[in-house]
Structure formats: C-alpha cells, structure tokens
Interface confidence: low
C-alpha cells in the first residue's frame, strides 16, 4: 500500500519519508535510503521511541509459564503476564511461582493473587486500612 | 551543510595512547550514528568502528581490544583512543556519518605517525 | 588482504565507458547492500553510490552501479579527466559484523 506522509506519495516498498537529519518515528527504523525509514513488520518487530536503529527490536515471545496480556504492534512490545495461579514480582526475571493457596493461621487473606504478586495476608487484628 | 572535523596529535610514540576527536557541526550529532575509519599510506581503507548517539559502539575485531570510542553529545564531539600502537598503527583517520549502513558525509582527515 | 576484492587498475580514454568490479561473499555483498566511494588525490572519500544503484544528488548520472548475487560493478560511462581517483567498494559483513571495504581501485584516465 501506498503511504501519504508529508504530501509524497511513496510505492509499495513502504518509505516513510524523514528529512535528513531527523529521527525515524516510533514503528520505524533507519533505512539504507538517505532520508528514509523503514515501517516495522507488525508482530515482527518495534521501535517504542524515535531512533536511529539499523533493524526494529525483536518482539518478545512469551514463554511456556505465560500468557499474553498484549500482542506486539510496531510501536510496543508483546506484553506478557504469568497464567492465572501464578505470580512474579514487578522488578523480578525469575520463573512464575505458584500462588500461596491460603495465609497461615490468624491471618486473613487481604488481596488475591493477580500475575504481579502473590495472595497478602495480614494479621486479624491488625487495622491496615482493609475492610476484613 | 554538515562537516566533521578530526583533531589531534599527529605524532604519538610507539607503545603510547593515540587519541583523536571528531567534532561536527551544522547538524545533530543525536540523530546518527559515527565511524571512524583510516587508511595506511598508499593503502586502502579500514573501518575502526562506530558510535551511536546513545554510547553503543561496534568494534573492527582486529582491532577490538585496542580500541575505545565515546560521545559527548554536549560539546558534538566522537573522540577515538588506540591504546598500545605501533608503527602500523600510520595512518590518515577520517571520522565519517553513517546513515543507516552508509557513510555520507567524511572529515577532511588528520596524519597520524607513530614513531619514536 | 581486504575481504572485497577489487582490481588494483584500470584506465580509459575520454568518453569511454569503464567498468570497476567488487568481488565478495554470501556473508557480505550477498545478503548486504553495496556502497561505492571516490577519493581523489589528497582529499577524503566521497561517497559515490549508495544502495548498490542509488546515487546521491550531485552525483552525475555517468556513474552507475549493480549488484548481482555476491558481486557489485562500478561503470563509469563518458570518462572525463576528473574521474581519475581511487574507487573502493564498500559493504557490511554479517559474519564479521562490521563495514568492510576492497582494497581500491585506481583508475588513469589515459591521454
């Protein structure tokens, strides 16, 4: 398909044009062709910020222990989540863990468990700001 | 018009440090990426490596652990170190733009002789 | 030795047409573009053509590339005085993951 960007129509190779001397944009990388960049192959590959690359960055596949929360476009990256039941930290590159099936005894259970953190637990009488 | 300018010793000894700077002007040194390539005397022309404008660089393996470039987009300037050189170390540098994997604008170049 | 493989010469007359070879591999000129560069005497390189075929604005149309399989051709057509200079070919090397040049060709444009 034909591009229109800044009233030039380019071909079927997908030019999108960037003044020499300019960044490419998000979803595009810097083309062999002064002047020019080339659009990231959807599901391929992405660039989340203006650049320079020589290739867009590799979508990421999800691994075995996940799911997809969000495919990869040519702007973002796939988004990937652990599967219902387990969890893993925010800042963590561990495997996903199994989730804590209840709190031990004289606590009670404040927060389910979702794909960022395990179950919380506090203890009965302590006044936390939760309604127990 | 985008220009580049190589500047530095040009004569270092043998064994020492040769350092050189490029520095740009008339356009963005954010937007590129920037090599520095060099040619032997009456030889041809070998690539040194490159730079991007966030501090990524790529290195010729020949010359890989001798090598070291840095960029400091404040004062637009790319310089180049070559630790431990040698007489076949002689050489014109040139510093040169890169847009995506062509070199399109060249500095005029600066001698280097290594020689005690 | 250079990884490119270039004549070392080549001459003409004026108005002739001549033809500069660049001989590489499958890790390089087979899967990469090819980039052409003139350095004439006692200046810095100047690139020439770009993207095996493509030539910069102020390049004259004489001069045109091609690439075919692991292999580029300069060809310099309606030679003039001021084409004497060095031509080297240009490329990148995925195995080696960096640019690579041949080692120049130096053309004498005769009487």
């Known amino acids: 398909a034909t591009i229109k960007l800044h009233d030039q129509s380019i071909g079927t190779q997908q030019w999108e044009h960037s003044p020499l001397g300019e960044l490419c944009p998000p979803g595009s990388h810097r083309s062999e062709r002064p002047g020019a960049c080339n659009r990231c192959t959807e599901g391929v590959g992405y660039t989340n910020a203006s650049n320079n690359l020589f290739a867009c960055l590799p979508c990421t596949a999800c691994k075995s222990d996940e799911e997809e929360r969000s495919p990869c476009t040519t702007t973002r990256n796939t988004a990937c989540q652990c599967k219902p039941g387990t969890f893993r930290n925010d800042n963590s590159a561990e495997m996903c863990r199994k989730c804590s099936t209840g709190c031990p005894r004289g606590m009670v259970k404040v927060k389910d468990c979702t794909p960022w953190s395990d179950i919380e637990c506090v203890h009965k009488e302590s006044g936390n700001g939760h309604n127990i | 018009q985008v220009q580049l300018q190589e500047s530095g010793p040009g004569l270092v000894k043998p064994s020492e440090t040769l350092s050189l700077t490029c520095t740009v002007s008339?356009?963005?040194?954010?937007?590129?990426?920037w090599s520095w390539v060099r040619q032997s005397p009456g030889k041809g022309l070998e690539w040194i490596g490159s730079?991007?404008?966030?501090?990524?660089?790529n290195y010729n393996p020949s010359l890989k652990s001798r090598v070291t470039m840095t960029i400091d987009k404040s004062k637009k300037q790319f310089p180049l170190k070559i630790d431990s050189v040698t007489a076949a170390d002689t050489a014109m540098y040139y510093c040169?733009?890169?847009?995506?994997?062509?070199?399109?604008?060249w500095g005029q170049g600066t001698l280097v002789t290594v020689s005690s | 030795s250079y990884v490119l493989t270039q004549p070392p010469s080549a001459s003409g007359t004026p108005g002739q047409r001549v033809t500069i070879s660049c001989a590489g591999s499958?890790?390089?000129?087979?899967?990469?573009?090819v980039n052409w560069y003139q350095q004439l005497p006692a200046t810095a390189p100047k690139l020439l053509i770009y993207?095996?075929?493509q030539r910069p604005s102020g390049v004259p149309d004489r001069f045109s590339g091609s690439k075919s399989g692991t292999s580029a051709s300069l060809a310099i057509s309606g030679l003039q005085s001021e084409d004497e200079a060095d031509y080297y070919c240009?490329?990148?090397?995925?195995?080696?993951?960096?640019?690579?040049f041949g080692g120049g060709t130096k053309l004498t444009v005769l009487g």
């Open positions: 040169a733009r890169q847009l995506g994997r062509i070199s399109d604008y």
């Open positions: 008339g356009g963005s040194i954010s937007d590129y990426y």
């Open positions: 730079i991007d404008y966030a501090g990524s660089t």
């Open positions: 499958s890790s390089n000129i087979g899967g990469n573009t």
């Open positions: 993207s095996n075929n």
């Open positions: 240009a490329t990148w090397d995925d195995s080696r993951g960096g640019w690579v």
